[in-house]
Interface confidence: low
């Protein structure tokens, strides 16, 4: 089976605009990838499967997805506990001022998350 | 003072080890990577991957997958690299380097050096 | 792995001149507004030295004759005025994926 969980942090060194609402925007698609390419860094282990349903919100940067991995190979305080000690290397590797983390279980199905 | 202190220089056979140390001083060792750097005869620089000493976290150049070890000693803020199987190819001078942000601006990059470690491969 | 093609391989150029090393890497190096690219100057039997880091900020205590300016995937590595100190070779280093990946080098010399 699968888990998945949701989560949620500020980037506090950037900007919000309209073309974070717009999934066909270069600003939309690098800042997606990147982040992508970060949660791989991050959750190298094999039990991670990838991230979904990234939004961006307002407030400098918030970013929200769905995270999801092998079912028993991870749980929330893992999740939440690993990507907090990442946040140092996230400011040095990808320039990326993090707080207000947060991470929740997500029902099945995941989607009513996004 | 930021400082890397690299081990002396080696001799080896082909087919054996070298195990390189490098000394950190004068920073907080455990947040910054450590990153490897090779200099071989007139084929300029080439990274070997880094490790972050207070995780023991690494990241290897795959060409050398396999074959080079990094590893963190925090209690003497040592960082070693460990290059097995060798060949003439791997004569080379090694460097180890602080990816760190004492770049004005608090940017992060290749900022501090060791002297440089030689290792020659020889039968 | 991104491959820096770095251009010339050696450059001669006369005392007080200015001196232009060129880097293209092949796919884009910068990250959310963010180029990682590193210039390094090393002399022989000496460690590379850094000069300018993400692309165009000089390091702390390299003389401002030295400055570097593109984008995305083409850099420059600028003297503005050689003096006989510069001699060494030059490189630049990506640092937006694994592995990081140098250019071949550029060799300064006096003309």
């Known amino acids: 089976g699968v888990s998945f969980f949701f989560l949620s942090f500020h980037i506090s060194n950037l900007q919000f605009n309209s073309s974070l609402e717009d999934p066909s925007t270069d600003y939309y698609q690098e800042l997606q990838r990147d982040i992508s390419e970060m949660f791989l860094q991050i959750y190298k282990q094999g039990g991670f499967l990838g991230l979904s349903n990234i939004k961006f919100r307002p407030g400098s940067v918030v970013v929200q997805l769905t995270l999801a991995f092998r079912e028993g190979t991870i749980n929330v305080h893992d999740v939440e506990t690993q990507f907090n000690q990442y946040k140092t290397e996230a400011a040095s590797r990808y320039n990326l001022t993090i707080s207000d983390v947060s991470v929740s279980d997500v029902p099945f199905p995941f989607s009513a998350q996004s | 003072e930021v400082q890397l202190v690299q081990s002396g220089a080696e001799v080896k056979k082909p087919g054996a080890s070298v195990k390189v140390s490098c000394k950190a001083s004068?920073?907080?060792?455990?947040?910054?990577?450590i990153e490897w750097v090779r200099e071989r005869p007139g084929h300029g620089l080439e990274w070997m991957g880094e490790?972050?000493?207070?995780?023991?976290?690494?990241n290897y150049n795959e060409k050398f997958k396999g074959r080079v070890t990094f590893t963190a000693d925090t209690s003497t803020n040592t960082v070693y690299m460990e290059l097995s199987s060798l060949t003439s190819e791997d004569t080379a001078v090694y460097y180890c380097?602080?990816?760190?942000?004492?770049?004005?601006?608090?940017?992060?990059?290749?900022?501090?050096w060791g002297q440089g470690t030689t290792v020659t491969v020889s039968s | 792995d991104i491959v820096m093609t770095q251009s010339p391989d050696s450059l001669a150029v006369s005392l007080g001149e200015r001196a232009t090393i060129n880097c293209r890497a092949s796919?884009?190096?910068?990250?959310?507004?963010?180029?990682?690219i590193h210039w390094y100057q090393q002399k022989p039997g000496q460690p590379p030295k850094l000069l300018i880091y993400?692309?165009?900020n000089l390091e702390t205590g390299v003389p401002d004759r030295f400055s570097g300016s593109g984008s995305r995937t083409d850099f420059t590595l600028t003297i503005s005025s050689l003096q006989a100190e510069d001699v060494a070779v030059y490189y630049c280093?990506?640092?937006?994926?694994?592995?990081?990946?140098f250019g071949g080098g550029t060799k300064v010399e006096i003309k």
């Open positions: 490790i972050l000493p207070g995780t023991g976290r690494t």
């Open positions: 993400h692309a165009s």
């Open positions: 380097a602080r990816y760190g942000d004492d770049t004005s601006g608090g940017y992060y990059a290749v900022d501090y």
């Open positions: 796919e884009s190096v910068n990250i959310l507004g963010t180029n990682l």
């Open positions: 004068g920073y907080r060792f455990i947040p910054y990577w």
């Open positions: 280093l990506q640092s937006r994926k694994i592995p990081w990946t």
